[in-house]
């Protein structure tokens, strides 16, 4: 799915007014990305509990297991983002898969992801049938990681 | 930094030809995202070795440590992506931070990220000074995770 952009003009890149109204489905088709998180969403109970499974997706087999929470905004590209939520404060023992080991912390890995928001163009509200895509950095938690606790110097 | 889009037209959203040439810096300014990976790039030696540090960024404190490798494409938004490369085949012991534990595997967590490519508009090569942004899913490894080995049923 492509987006046609005109080069030049004062705002990078700036386009001419439209002759017709774009069907909402078109924007949604273009803006919707893969609505799946990095790992398939597991609907079994263990994906939500503090234990490391021996099967299933990576987030439930991890010794720092996590679940995914959907963040949906239809004015954003991508529309759907997933935030990892750690299911344990400490890492789960590799031996048992259930008991927590206080030597390790289960912590979220954050990332500033590039996203785009559909906005009215500056100073053009209600005049033209055009819109702006505004690039922003959006903080998401990607996964939970088992780390050794930080030792302060 | 905004991108102005015209609504309507047969291609979603489609723009008129430009009157002038856009300065390269403008596209690059708009398309360049945060050039830092989820964790700050560590230039110390331990970030590249198979051990779990007690300080430093999350990727070096993890018991499934990883380094970040840059993926740069100036025709893509974001221009810079980072791929996680696992530094150990197994997880590092929480006790020692150096010896590997065969009970756990250190594996990459993959994600199909939404990216956009700058392309000539279909059937318009050499004619108009406009371009298309093509949405694609691009596979990146986000981090390395310590998991219990999968037990096949």
């Amino acid at each position: 799915v492509s987006l046609r952009i005109q080069e030049g003009c004062s705002h990078l890149p700036s386009c001419c007014p439209s002759k017709e109204q774009e069907p909402p489905e078109e924007w949604l088709k273009w803006s919707s990305a893969s609505v799946s998180p990095p790992e398939p969403l597991s609907h079994t109970h263990h994906a939500e509990s503090c234990r490391a499974s021996k099967d299933g997706p990576l987030n439930s087999r991890a010794i720092s297991p996590w679940s995914y929470e959907l963040d949906r905004d239809l004015n954003r590209v991508p529309q759907d983002l997933y935030h990892a939520r750690c299911l344990c404060p400490h890492c789960v023992s590799l031996q048992t898969g259930s008991h927590m080991d206080p030597l390790g912390n289960s912590v979220p890995l954050y990332h500033n992801q590039t996203v785009f928001y559909r906005r009215p163009c500056h100073g053009e509200e209600g005049t033209h049938r055009r819109y702006c895509l505004e690039r922003r950095l959006y903080r998401v938690s990607l996964a939970c990681v088992c780390v050794r606790p930080r030792v302060m110097a | 930094v905004s991108l102005r889009i015209q609504e309507g037209c047969s291609h979603l959203p489609s723009c008129c030809p430009s009157k002038e040439q856009e300065p390269p810096e403008e596209w690059l300014k708009w398309s360049s995202a945060s050039v830092s990976p989820p964790e700050p790039l560590s230039h110390t030696h331990h970030a590249e070795s198979c051990r779990a540090s007690k300080d430093g960024p999350l990727n070096s404190r993890a018991i499934s440590p990883w380094s970040y490798e840059l993926d740069r494409d100036l025709n893509r938004v974001p221009q810079d992506l980072y791929h996680a490369r696992c530094l150990c085949p197994h997880c590092v012991s929480l006790q020692t931070g150096s010896h590997m534990d065969p009970l756990g595997n250190s594996v990459p967590l993959y994600h199909n990220q939404t990216v956009f490519y700058r392309r000539p508009c279909h059937g318009e090569e050499g004619t108009h000074r406009r371009y298309c942004l093509e949405r694609r899913l691009y596979r990146v490894s986000l981090a390395c995770v310590c998991v219990r080995p999968r037990v096949m049923a």
């Epitope: - | 690059l28 300014k29 840059l70």
Partner: antibody
């Protein structure tokens, strides 16, 4: 107009470090999208890319030679320096520096659009 | 690392003849670039981004292709076209530039 010129020793002994300088004019390496690379060509053989440095000081190296190469830039002097450690007779080649930095309406070009004339480096004891 | 294989390695042609040089990538790539090199000279760009002619390059040169297979065509050979031709690509991860091994165009 854009010009690039390579300079450095013509003869280097095995195990020594080779230092090559590319002095350029007609463009600035601080301009977004601008980059400069080093390419070599052993006598009678093909071109081989070695290293690249971008306007924002991001550097890339040929994986097989990464441990031996270092590329740096001095924007104020309009110079890029390539150092290669532990040279061997197989490193005998003409070394070129080349610019990259063309953005067309259809996108950024990853071609080297301007080249220096090259400098022949012989590695021999 | 992606490998580029050019064929043929050497090609003999006569002025006025149509010539085609192939470049095959070991995995799919988005674009290909082409250079011409004459003895004792630095390479000069011919084709940008698969099919766009570099400045000052005669229209008898053209480029095409997609995926793994790319082609440089000279519609009617001129005496000044006898040279060595290289294909080149850029790969974003890890960021690397790769050249083909070259095709030498000789006068028949």
């Amino acid at each position: 107009q854009v010009t690039l010129k390579e300079s450095g020793p013509t003869l280097v002994k095995p195990t020594q470090t080779l230092t090559l300088t590319c002095t350029f004019s007609g463009f600035s390496l601080s301009t977004s999208g601008m980059g400069l690379g080093w390419i070599r060509q052993p006598p009678g053989k093909a071109l081989e890319w070695l290293a690249h440095i971008w306007w924002d000081d991001v550097k890339h190296y040929k994986p097989a030679l990464k441990s031996r190469l270092t590329i740096t830039k001095d924007t104020s002097k309009n110079q890029v320096v390539l150092t290669m450690t532990n040279v061997d007779p197989v490193d005998t080649a003409t070394y070129y520096c080349a610019r990259m930095g063309q953005l067309h309406y259809y996108g950024y070009d990853y071609a080297m659009d301007y080249w220096g004339q090259g400098t022949l480096v012989t590695v021999s004891s | 690392e992606i490998v580029l294989t050019q064929s043929p390695a050497t090609l003999s042609a006569s002025p006025g003849e149509r010539v085609t040089i192939s470049c095959s990538a070991s995995s799919s790539v988005s674009y290909m670039y082409w250079y011409q090199q004459k003895p004792g000279q630095a390479p000069r760009p011919l084709i940008y981004r698969t099919s766009n002619l570099a400045s000052g390059v005669p229209a008898r040169f053209s480029g095409s292709g997609s995926g793994t297979d790319y082609t440089l065509t000279i519609s009617s050979m001129e005496p000044e076209d006898f040279a060595t031709y290289y294909c080149q690509l850029y790969h974003s991860y890890p960021p690397t530039w790769t050249f083909g091994q070259g095709t030498k165009l000789e006068i028949k």
